[in-house]
């Protein structure tokens, strides 16, 4: 997994990388295997009803440095992990949802009578 503070651009691999894809298979994938010049990823996020959904697939080199950095997004529970060390390496990635943050449900200051 890439560290949050990492800013170096990913170096191109000399060869294509094959990744498992699930819910995120491009047209050129075969038997749930996609190919990329970048990273394999596995991502977990909450759907509209609050249920965790896991997707996996390929990220092209272009822009994948940013996508793999897993920058927290306000009001969105999501976590992504990326890898390149071997083909289908994302089968072994198991990102977990970040913990729920305590929310202050009070709209304004509380006035006592």
């Amino acid at each position: 997994k890439k560290e949050d503070g990492e800013s170096t651009a990913p170096t191109p691999r000399p060869k294509v990388l094959r990744c498992k894809c699930h819910h995120h298979c491009p047209e050129d994938s075969v038997n749930n295997i996609c190919s990329t010049d970048g990273y394999c990823f596995t991502m977990i996020e909450e759907d509209d009803s609050g249920l965790p959904v896991v997707t996996s697939g390929c990220l092209g080199l272009e822009g994948s440095d940013f996508q793999c950095r897993d920058t927290p997004i306000p009001h969105q529970r999501r976590s992504i992990e990326c890898c390149t060390e071997r083909n289908e390496c994302n089968k072994d990635l198991h990102p977990t949802l970040p913990p729920l943050k305590n929310r202050d449900f009070v709209d304004g200051p509380i006035h006592h009578r």
Partner: antibody
Framework: QVQLQQPGAEVVKPGASVKLSCKAS????????MQWVKQRPGQGLEWIGE????????MYNQKFKGKATLIVDTSSSTAYMQLSSLTSEDSAVYFC?????????WGQGTTLTVSS | DVVMTQTPLSLPVSLGDQASISCRSS???????????LHWYLQKPGQSPNLLIY???NRFSGVPDRFSGSGSGTDFTLKISRVEAEDLGVYFC?????????FGSGTKLEIK
Amino acid sequence: QVQLQQPGAEVVKPGASVKLSCKASGYTFTNYWMQWVKQRPGQGLEWIGEIDPSDRYTMYNQKFKGKATLIVDTSSSTAYMQLSSLTSEDSAVYFCARFGYYVDYWGQGTTLTVSS
Amino acid sequence: DVVMTQTPLSLPVSLGDQASISCRSSQSLVHSTGNTYLHWYLQKPGQSPNLLIYKVSNRFSGVPDRFSGSGSGTDFTLKISRVEAEDLGVYFCSQSTHVPFTFGSGTKLEIK
């Protein structure tokens, strides 16, 4: 310089198996996939499959599944293709080829003759 | 499988002439990464193929600049600006976007 060395010819009997070799030199063997391609006279080039020597991951053309098995020996930087249950249809020139995102170097090819 | 259709099958030329070979694919060769993996090879009699052009228009190292590639999507062209004797042989296009990878049937460049 990149070189892929293949034996010039192999003659085998129908029903037998054969193991074709491809010795790589001039580059880091595990940094590239190795592909195998079949060429029969008047029938063009056919992609058999490929193997990534770094993790021995293989991908095959469905047409050659059960016919071809790809393996590597990283200690000698050699790729092998085993062909089984040979028939006259398997008589062809077989090329190994280095692949990153495209094939940039080819072996000279092994002419396989299946004959009794 | 992606079918690669090459035309013409045979191309008789005079030395010094321009030659043009067409390659059409049955599906778009634009990969999900945005790259187009369409390549051109020359095979001389009794030899293995040699890479000329990779990813549509990039000349491989040592390939003379009289060779050029163009196209997009499903339609591609290889041009040789001034044919020399050493250019004679069979030209193949090839795609590595979709598995299984496939090749054109070849175009034989010969002297008129």
